[in-house]
């Protein structure tokens, strides 16, 4: 009898009430693998969720978040409110990044600006709430002791400073 059920393809279930005949999944349900004894209820994308892919007899519905929200968790199990770049979501809503931190996305937390000096670099462009610092050449490249009267050859390897 077990062999009869294993013959039931995806999109059907093995109906014990009908001598293990393969019956199609009822409306709003699906089975993604063969040999199933029941069909699973289709996920419904309601509220902050919107349908990305309709449910079929062989696959569950897939949800996205409505505008102003973004997905969290496996298979978009939750929707979280978007913030603007330069902000982070707190319990009290969207708050601007503190000085010295940035967030370049509509989600996630504010992160500290890169400390260029820790990486042996100088600052090329200052950071903002929306953008990290851009580091430039190392201070050693900029020091008088590193200078030379000879300008760099135009064909030198990139990544090297003019000294």
């Amino acid at each position: 009898l077990q062999d009869l059920c294993s013959n039931c393809p995806a999109g059907t279930f093995c109906d014990n009430n009908r001598s293990q005949i393969c019956s199609p999944c009822p409306p709003n349900s699906f089975s993604s693998a063969g040999g199933q004894r029941t069909c699973d209820i289709c996920r419904q994308c309601k509220g902050v969720f919107k349908t990305r892919k309709e449910c079929s007899s062989t696959s569950n519905a897939e949800c996205d978040c409505i505008s102003g929200y973004h997905c969290l968790g496996a298979e978009c199990s939750m929707c979280e409110q978007d913030c603007k770049q330069g902000q982070e979501l707190t319990k009290k809503g969207c708050k601007d990044c503190c000085f010295g931190t940035f967030n370049d996305q509509k989600r996630g937390i504010c992160r500290p600006w890169t400390n260029c000096s820790l990486d042996g670099k100088s600052v090329l462009v200052n950071g903002t709430k929306e953008r990290d610092v851009v580091c430039g050449p190392s201070p050693a490249d900029l020091s008088p002791g590193a200078s030379s009267a000879t300008p760099p050859a135009p064909a030198r390897e990139p990544g090297h400073s003019p000294q």
Epitope: T114, V125, D132, V134, G136, G159
Partner: nanobody, 125 residues
């Protein structure tokens, strides 16, 4: 790879103006910021001005604020430095610089900064 070529340098009298250009070629899509550095005789490199290629945000050295303006034309892959009210102390070799990444991050096997060959600016009466 990114190649940078400066132009526009020369000899000019104090109080006059010059405009430097820096034309970028190659993998210009990877450039996030560009800047102008200068090196006066016997001195180290000094950052004059810098610009974010995306939003055009700019930074200036105190010594040039109100006199110099950095700008870019992304459609031409070119950065400019408009230098007004030039002074003798602005005499230097001016170098174009490009950076391919925020913070100090860089990809293994990829250069993250590039320099032009330099253009001489001499302010003299």
């Amino acid at each position: 790879q990114v190649q940078l070529v400066e132009s526009g340098g020369g000899v000019v009298q104090p109080g006059r103006s010059l405009r430097l250009s820096c034309a970028a070629s190659g993998s210009t899509f990877s450039i996030v910021a560009m800047g102008w550095y200068r090196q006066a005789p016997g001195k180290g490199l000094e950052l004059v001005a810098s610009i974010i290629t995306g939003d055009g945000d700019t930074n200036y050295a105190d010594s040039v604020k109100g006199r110099f303006t950095i700008s870019r034309d992304n459609s031409k892959n070119t950065m400019y430095l408009q230098m007004n009210s030039l002074r003798a102390e602005d005499t230097a070799v001016y170098y174009c610089y490009a950076r391919t990444g925020y913070g100090s991050s860089w990809l293994m096997g990829h250069e993250y900064d590039y320099w032009g060959q330099g253009t001489q600016v001499t302010v003299s009466s």
